[in-house]
Amino acid sequence: NIDVCKLGTVTVQPAPVIPLGSAANISCSLNPKQGCSHYPSSNELILLKFVNDVLVENLHGKKVHDHTGHSSTFQVTNLSLGMTLFVCKLNCSNSQKKPPVPVCGVEISVGVAPEPPQNISCVQEGENGTVACSWNSGKVTYLKTNYTLQLSGPNNLTCQKQCFSDNRQNCNRLDLGINLSPDLAESRFIVRVTAINDLGNSSSLPHTFTFLDIVIPLPPWDIRINFLNASGSRGTLQWEDEGQVVLNQLRYQPLNSTSWNMVNATNAKGKYDLRDLRPFTEYEFQISSKLHLSGGSWSNWSESLRTRTPEEEPVGILDIWYMKQDIDYDRQQISLFWKSLNPSEARGKILHYQVTLQEVTKKTTLQNTTRHTSWTRVIPRTGAWTASVSAANSKGASAPTHINIVDLCGTGLLAPHQVSAKSENMDNILVTWQPPKKADSAVREYIVEWRALQPGSITKFPPHWLRIPPDNMSALISENIKPYICYEIRVHALSESQGGCSSIRGDSKHKAPVSGPHITAITEKKERLFISWTHIPFPEQRGCILHYRIYWKERDSTAQPELCEIQYRRSQNSHPISSLQPRVTYVLWMTAVTAAGESPQGNEREFCPQGKAN
């Protein structure tokens, strides 16, 4: 804080505000009868320079003029942009102990004249909004700079408003607080911005506009949709708009979509009919407005209207499959399965399925409704049966899908040939086959069916299947395919009244099994040893097991073990070997092999055959 200048004065030439790069002379003068009391000639005036309250320089060596004991003039140069404080102090040199006494001080501001403001842009939000203009001020001036926004228009009227920039606030936008009304639509307005500070002034180029150029309509509001006769595909979108709007843009999309449907509507007057909506679909609707067909700006998009279109009766055909199991000599269990319709086919919430099983000749019909995607019934083994399923929502039911119940694997001549399963990547398997060689009736379609080879999978899990046209001989299966799991894959060839099938195992990715089979027993029968084992637990198989290996060697031998390789069959859990010597103790163990390699060995068992073995 500078004390009130009791001892003297400080003046600046040419002025306390100077352009960057200019020099200034600072004069410090003592008032009469002020100074060092005993020895006026010992008065020494010193000038200190402060930036941000920090002393940065003693300008003792910059004196250009000195009236000893009365006044001194200092020249200051290379001042940086912004404000610098100079304090003049009196140093009574005969008294070393007393600090210099402040006389007076002055602030010098260094800056630049304002550049002409550029890029003026004005907007009025809505017919009842007010005009606000923004501009680019150019380089920072480092001085308080006043900006005047001036708008001239019809009726010889000019309005203006002011703001200023300094080191605390920036002025590059002003709201004039005035409204241009539609009756001025044809009028031209001129706006300019003038900048003034202590070092000069400058004016922007005039910027001309019309009402239509700057008025941005308010976005439409109160959006709603009315579905004609509860239709799921036709609706009238309605909204409120400002009175002068002549053009609207509508955009709408299903909520999970990534691209909008766009529609332009002229003179819509807050109403537009949409005819291509998808039933029972969550949609988002937005509207924008414009005041002129060719000129002017679009409003912001309105707030979204989110709504679901009404249901319509399902369309499309259910994909049905079935399984047959004989229960006894005159009864069989039929399990029907079907895939849910996709949303565009279901066109609503599926409430239930109508299932019909019909014996063609005797006209026996079993009917039921279910909410599930499977249905099981026990029926006689005799007769020709057909099944149909349709899906129902609140508006109606789909056309029933029919399938003939045939013995799926009953006709060897219809069995596809050379079925193979190759892993394509982590989550799919390519199945290929050749058509049946001597089919006596035409193949109508192929069904590729698969299920995980895990305990209980037949009862716990429905099958997965793909329908393949008769001229295709391959299928890429991916639904519910996981790596390191073995699947039983069946390819069915179906004619009108018969079926044939071939089976193969496949996996999408494999590793060597975690462990080998566990030998549970070794028994001797008729000069042969029977090795019994338990299969490797399902999670440890890590793919399809191709074969098992039984190893044996004499107990203390260092020779390579002998081995016997057995083709893997899920149903098999014992195997005979006959090349062991009697009364010799052997160590036996087993391993399992997948396409990726061999497992570690399972448990070791010792056995000494008793009888004659050759």
């Epitope: 009227l157 309005c159 408003k161 709201d175 607080g177 005035i178 409204n179 241009l180 001025l184």
Partner: nanobody, 129 residues
């Protein structure tokens, strides 16, 4: 009772300056629109300058006086001024102070006499050549 009282008029030589004052009493107009009109003999009363009354006060001027006239107000004192520089003989007229009881937002309404609810008696300005 609302009263607007103008003062500061007089006889001035061309090129001179005047500062007209309008003091309002009976009501606060600090946030509302105020304006100066003038009427020369045998002519209609015409708009000279105005203040919109909206936040920050936008000033309006007839193009004929733009740059020479400056309108301002002191809300605390309920007073409005018109600084007139470089007076011309055609500035000779009775100058009236007018006040509205609302903010004037519409560009088109600022210069209309019907926009303003209260008027002063006027102060004579005569410019001699």
């Amino acid at each position: 009772q609302v009263q607007l009282q103008e003062s500061g008029g007089g006889l001035v030589q061309a090129g001179g300056s005047l500062r007209l004052s309008c003091a309002a009493s009976g009501r606060t107009f600090s946030n509302y629109a105020m304006a100066w009109f003038r009427q020369a003999p045998g002519t209609e009363r015409e708009f000279v300058a105005g203040l919109s009354g909206s936040g920050g006060d936008t000033a309006f001027y007839d193009n004929s006086v733009m740059g020479r006239f400056t309108i301002s107000r002191d809300s605390a004192k309920n007073t409005m001024w018109l600084q007139i520089n470089n007076l011309k003989p055609e500035d000779t007229a009775v100058y009236y102070c007018a006040a509205a009881t609302h903010v004037v937002v519409s560009y088109g309404l600022v210069r209309r006499r019907g926009t303003y609810d209260y008027w002063g008696q006027g102060t004579q300005v005569t410019v001699s050549s």
